[in-house]
Amino acid sequence: NEGSVTGSCYCGKRISSDSPPSVQFMNRLRKHLRAYHRCLYYTRFQLLSWSVCGGNKDPWVQELMSCLDLKECGHAYSGIVAHQKHLLPTSPPISQASEGASSDIHTPAQMLLSTLQSTQRPTLPVGSLSSDKELTRPNETTIHTAGHSLAAGPEAGENQKQPEKNAGPTARTSAT
């Protein structure tokens, strides 16, 4: 159904191979990514309320697919920390993040509630709640497949257990 307006391969925005997304746009994609669909010549990325497509061979497309596969994007994505308290001189931010069972959070409202209720993470990454408006959009459609929603995913229940220690001094957050 490639090209179909109603099918999983409909594109809201097509990114040309000649002009890959900027770093800022990639960060936005990482943060809001909910799913991807492999189409014939391109991949469609489903975000909270819109979609974007790119050529299957484009490096940024491969990177985003890998990111979602490894659960490093989307719901679980915490974003780069710009400013954070409790920093040790040579250590990265105290993450306090922990992962729990994959609770099947079916609605954006529940996702927001889950995030707000998480008192285990006093040092939230900057911008981690910047998508509140998107999370509660009334026109957001949650597509259910095999008992899971796009709003949830592997380890969607993270940050709901006890706090954890973060990595030691060798895990650096400086820009590469």
Epitope: A35, M65, L68, I80, G147
Partner: antibody, heavy 118, light 113 residues
Framework: EVQLVESGGGLVQPGGSLKLSCAAS????????MNWVRQASGKGLEWVAR??????????FYADSVKGRFTFSRDDSKNTAYLQMNSLKTEDTAMYYC?????????WGQGTLVTVSS | DIQMTQSPSSLSASVGDRVTITCKSS????????????LAWYQQKPGQSPKLLIY???TRQSGVPDRFSGSGSGTDFTLTISSLQAEDFATYYC?????????FGGGTKVEIK
């Protein structure tokens, strides 16, 4: 060729410390989610710890049995992961495997043996 | 935590036999975000580290003979060895990587009949 080489294992007394290292090559280390898994002699496999990638602030997660005693870290510039193990107990005796989870599969090292005994 | 139940715990078979090992998870391992099942199968021989055979439930790892195949979705998975070879006698584990903590099946020891 993907390679994960663990080192740092050995014999240590209860209450002692060890630091395991995992040197990686053959794949993009910075994009991999790293884990440690252990296996006591004749037993099954037990997950120990996980560390996420830089975009997720290198967040770490631990099995309940090691929480507060073990610390997982990574240095992407050196393609190396570390497991600092403190307050070791006899039940921590096992072969420790470093694993790299990538979209192309889960790679394992050959392991390093940790023996905690008095 | 997701529980992984593997069966049988051991089996005896002969070279050339078709062997089937099953693994059941306590919750679905299928992620709607990419339609992938977060399940892997390993082979382990005494004194060696686990060797990845199958990931994403059905994708054969590079270099693994095609007599090994994985199938299933959601909560029920199967590893099939179509024609058992002498070098296949080992212990096999399933593993879910859908959620932290990663959890493993108890293992299936494939022995020579």
């Amino acid at each position: 060729e993907v390679q994960l080489v663990e080192s740092g294992g050995g014999l240590v007394q209860p209450g002692g410390s060890l630091k395991l290292s995992c040197a990686a090559s053959g794949f993009t280390f910075s994009n991999a989610v790293m884990n440690w898994v252990r296996q006591a002699s004749g037993k099954g496999l037990e997950w120990v710890a996980r560390i996420r990638t830089k975009p997720n602030n290198y967040a770490t997660f631990y099995a309940d049995s090691v929480k507060g005693r073990f610390t997982f870290s990574r240095d992407d510039s050196k393609n190396t992961a570390y497991l600092q193990m403190n307050s070791l107990k006899t039940e921590d005796t096992a072969m420790y495997y470093c694993t790299a989870w990538t979209t192309e599969g889960i790679y394992w090292g050959q392991g390093t043996l940790v023996t905690v005994s008095s | 935590d997701i529980q992984m139940t593997q069966s049988p715990s051991s089996l005896s078979a002969s070279v050339g036999d078709r062997v089937t090992i099953t693994c059941k998870s306590s919750q679905s391992l299928l992620y709607s975000g990419n339609q992938k099942n977060y399940l892997a199968w390993y082979q382990q021989k005494p004194g060696q580290s686990p060797k990845l055979l199958i990931y994403w439930a059905s994708t054969r790892q590079s270099g693994v003979p095609d007599r090994f195949s994985g199938s299933g979705s959601g909560t029920d998975f199967t590893l099939t060895i179509s024609s058992l070879q002498a070098e296949d006698f080992a212990t096999y584990y399933c593993q879910q990587y859908y959620d932290t903590p990663w959890t493993f099946g108890g293992g299936t020891k494939v022995e020579i009949k």
